[in-house]
């Protein structure tokens, strides 16, 4: 399996966005990847989003997608919005070379993203 | 049932152009890469063509680069080889083939069609 | 010619065992898995290994790959006249515009 590295913790700041870099060892010359942002939470695995790019070009996730990012080399780094603290949990990288030939796949260990919604602003008067 | 079903194929002239296609069933179109191989009688198989499984990348031996382009249509499920300023040596069985994968491990042309076949002859 | 040299020929008798090599180089089969297909008669190719030794559902286990250096081996043991084919190997290449290469292939005669 293909190595792909991200770090252990990130905290998301005051408006819910988290942003991590997601780095891969790719064995061959990849010109198209997929990248794939999986939640980890109480043993569940779901689909956070997902995005193909070609090697040099931007990262493009649906419209109504939560992540955005951009790609450097073997590096893609990441940044998921409108996170509440119910959100907090295992966020997972996975990297798929999709194109050419061979196939590789690989799965980071995950990165624990905490959120802490925001105390409400007290009443002025 | 995973299946791959070639058409197109038949007699042209030296210099003459065919279009290739390969409808898939059985399995989620977009989600593989494809390749195009042929056969020339009483050979062995070489590679001609490849295409990403969102067609935004393509490959080609060699032998018909400038001459061959491949592309697909994934609402369609089909994968197309347009083959211009065909040649005799050109003459061959054409086959496509699904480049499979399966959890980190690449399955090579896990997947092939039963051929098509081309003759360049005058 | 073919980037991967396989031998034309093979031949055995039925229950023996037949060994079909392939030969590459260090951007091909040296760093990059090996596939077998058997094509028998008027047919298509058919995927007999994958990732160097693996086999597909429905091969049976007569059937298996090996892989050293730049070399790679098909065995077939107790050979069947069903068995009669010729077998392609393939491997990607990394110094080559197209990133698929096969062996010219092996024609594998049962006798008897």
């Known amino acids: 399996a293909m190595h792909v590295a991200q770090p252990a913790v990130v905290l998301a700041n005051s408006r819910g966005t988290a942003s991590f870099v997601c780095e891969y060892a790719s064995p061959g010359k990849a010109t198209e990847v997929r990248v794939t942002v999986l939640r980890q939470a109480d043993s569940q695995v779901t689909e956070v989003c997902a995005a193909t790019y070609m090697m040099g070009n931007e990262l493009t996730f649906l419209d109504d997608s939560i992540c955005t990012g951009t790609s450097s080399g073997n590096q893609v780094n990441l940044t998921i919005q409108g996170l509440r603290a119910m959100d907090t949990g295992l966020y997972i990288c996975k990297v798929e070379l999709m194109y050419p030939p061979p196939y590789y796949m690989g799965i980071g260990n995950g990165t624990q993203i905490y959120v802490i919604d925001p105390e409400p602003c007290p009443d002025s008067d | 049932e995973v299946q791959l079903l070639e058409s197109g194929g038949g007699l042209v002239q030296p210099g003459g152009s065919l279009r290739l296609s390969c409808a898939a069933s059985g399995f989620t179109f977009k989600a593989y890469s494809m390749s195009w191989i042929r056969q020339a009688p009483g050979k062995g198989l070489e590679w001609v063509s490849g295409?990403?499984?969102?067609?935004?990348?393509?490959d080609f031996a060699d032998s018909v680069k400038g001459r061959f382009t491949i592309s697909r249509d994934n609402s369609k499920n089909t994968l197309y080889l347009q083959m211009n300023s065909l040649r005799a040596e050109d003459t061959a069985m054409y086959y496509c083939?699904?480049?499979?994968?399966?959890?980190?491990?690449?399955?090579?042309?896990?997947?092939w069609g039963q051929g098509t076949l081309v003759t360049v002859s005058s | 010619q073919s980037v991967l040299t396989q031998p034309p020929s093979a031949s055995g008798t039925p229950g023996q065992r037949v060994t079909i090599s392939c030969s590459g180089s260090?951007?091909?089969?040296?760093?990059?898995?090996v596939y077998w297909y058997q094509q028998l008669p008027g047919t298509a190719p058919k995927l007999l290994i994958y990732?160097?030794?693996n086999r597909p559902s429905g091969v049976p286990d007569r059937f298996s790959g090996s892989k050293s250096g730049t070399s790679a081996s098909l065995a077939i043991s107790g050979l069947r006249s069903e068995d009669e084919a010729d077998y392609y190997c393939?491997?990607?290449?990394?110094?080559?515009?197209?990133?698929?290469?096969f062996g010219g292939g092996t024609k594998l005669t049962v006798l008897g």
């Open positions: 295409i990403s499984n969102t067609g935004g990348s393509t």
């Open positions: 393939q491997s990607y290449d990394s110094s080559l515009s197209g990133p698929v290469v």
């Open positions: 990732g160097n030794s």
């Open positions: 260090s951007s091909n089969i040296g760093s990059n898995y």
């Open positions: 083939a699904r480049l499979g994968y399966s959890g980190y491990d690449d399955r090579g042309m896990d997947v």
